[in-house]
């Protein structure tokens, strides 16, 4: 029998390389059985995750899973960092793994770092 617990499918230590000025959608895949839970996004500041209150979010429904989306329109340099989604379900708080956005400032296309180059810059996290 499949579990009817809410599950948030963000992979552990997932990372995205994105460009400032571009639009970007950060997805939190949510599995639930009956009532859709209340889901929020927060941004990590040290060990504290600060709830993102005034940000555009939306739901995208698919057959077996729903996506709670945080919209970046456009991406700004200070969007760099780690994010987590959380769901309230039957008085329980379920937290996802964090996912990290590495934001590159707008440059000419020839100067843009590749994903490989971005991956070698863990200092961007801090």
């Amino acid at each position: 029998k499949e579990s009817c617990d809410v599950q948030l499918y963000i992979k552990r230590q997932s990372e995205h390389s994105i460009l400032a000025g571009d639009p970007f959608e950060l997805e939190c895949p949510v599995k639930y059985c009956a009532n859709r839970p209340h889901v929020t996004w927060c941004k990590l500041n040290g060990t504290t995750c600060v709830k993102l209150e005034d940000r555009q979010t939306s739901w995208k429904e698919e057959k077996n899973i729903s996506f709670f989306i945080l919209h970046f329109e456009p991406v700004l340099p200070n969007d760099n960092g780690s994010y987590r989604c959380s769901a309230n379900f039957q008085s329980n708080l379920i937290e996802s793994h964090s996912t990290t956005l590495y934001v590159t400032d707008v440059k000419s296309a020839s100067e843009r770092p590749s994903k490989d180059e971005m991956a070698s810059r863990p200092w961007l996290l801090y």
Partner: antibody, heavy 119, light 112 residues
Framework: EVQLVQSGAEVKKPGESLKISCKGS????????MYWVRQMPGKGLEWIGR????????RYSPSFQGQVTISADKSISTAYLQLSSLKASDTAMYYC????????????WGQGTLVTVSS | DIVMTQSPDSLAVSLGERATINCKSS???????????LNWLQQKPGQSPKRLIY???KLDSGVPDRFSGSGSGTDFTLTISSVQAEDLAVYYC?????????FGQGTKLEIK
């Protein structure tokens, strides 16, 4: 059952380049991470790097950064390891492996690809 | 990088005896999610490595229960309660907490 099948053994000359493949089955690779490990003859295991097949994001060990390129084609559930400017010291068994990105509930290794670099 | 150090480098154990392999990391493997990403692999001669244990003590599917893992922080142990002939292999610990992932140097288990 999660399985990985790697491309066959290769013999190359110094200075040449090579791309080896690793095809996954039994799992949606977008839900996984795929990684590569080197084992030189008679030696231990060295982590080369990993890729998130969902978005192509890579992480490399500093020891291998700039020497190798990891890529993936999620449409055919395949990861690749490209080795450039091969040297005799690149002679090794190269393993790919895949693990569950959410809970690490599985970790499966390929059969290995033996690369021999010799003039 | 986190350095993983195993001891001993090799050990010879009689069939039915207990084998213990230690693994020490140069820094704590406790992650911010409260989990410790320490794995044990077994590599039999001429074969690919196979994961035996993950998250310090969880056994992979199909792994005999004579294998067990324990430890926390920086000190970890793999125990084989009653060594069988088919356990002849090299055993590796490795950490999945920080990048780059790193392996111990391996411990060769031989049968007396």
């Amino acid at each position: 059952e999660v399985q990985l099948v790697q491309s066959g053994a290769e013999v190359k000359k110094p200075g040449e380049s090579l791309k080896i493949s690793c095809k996954g089955s039994g799992v949606n690779i977008k839900d996984t991470y795929m990684y590569w490990v080197r084992q030189m003859p008679g030696k231990g295991l060295e982590w080369i790097g990993r890729i998130d097949p969902a978005n192509g994001y890579t992480r490399y060990s500093p020891s291998f950064q700039g020497q190798v390129t990891i890529s993936a084609d999620k449409s055919i559930s395949t990861a690749y390891l490209q080795l450039s400017s091969l040297k005799a010291s690149d002679t090794a068994m190269y393993y790919c492996a895949v693990y569950d990105g959410y809970y690490e509930s599985f970790d499966v290794w390929g059969q290995g690809t033996l690369v021999t670099v010799s003039s | 990088d986190i350095v993983m150090t195993q001891s001993p480098d090799s050990l010879a154990v009689s069939l039915g005896e207990r084998a213990t392999i230690n693994c020490k990391s140069s820094q704590s493997l406790l992650d911010s999610d409260g989990k410790t990403y320490l794995n044990w692999l077994q590599q039999k001669p001429g074969q690919s490595p196979k994961r035996l244990i993950y998250l310090v003590s969880k056994l992979d599917s199909g792994v005999p229960d004579r294998f067990s893992g324990s430890g926390s922080g920086t000190d970890f142990t793999l125990t084989i309660s009653s060594v069988q002939a088919e356990d002849l292999a090299v055993y590796y610990c490795w950490q999945g907490t920080l990048f780059p992932r790193t392996f111990g140097q391996g411990t060769k288990l031989e049968i007396k």
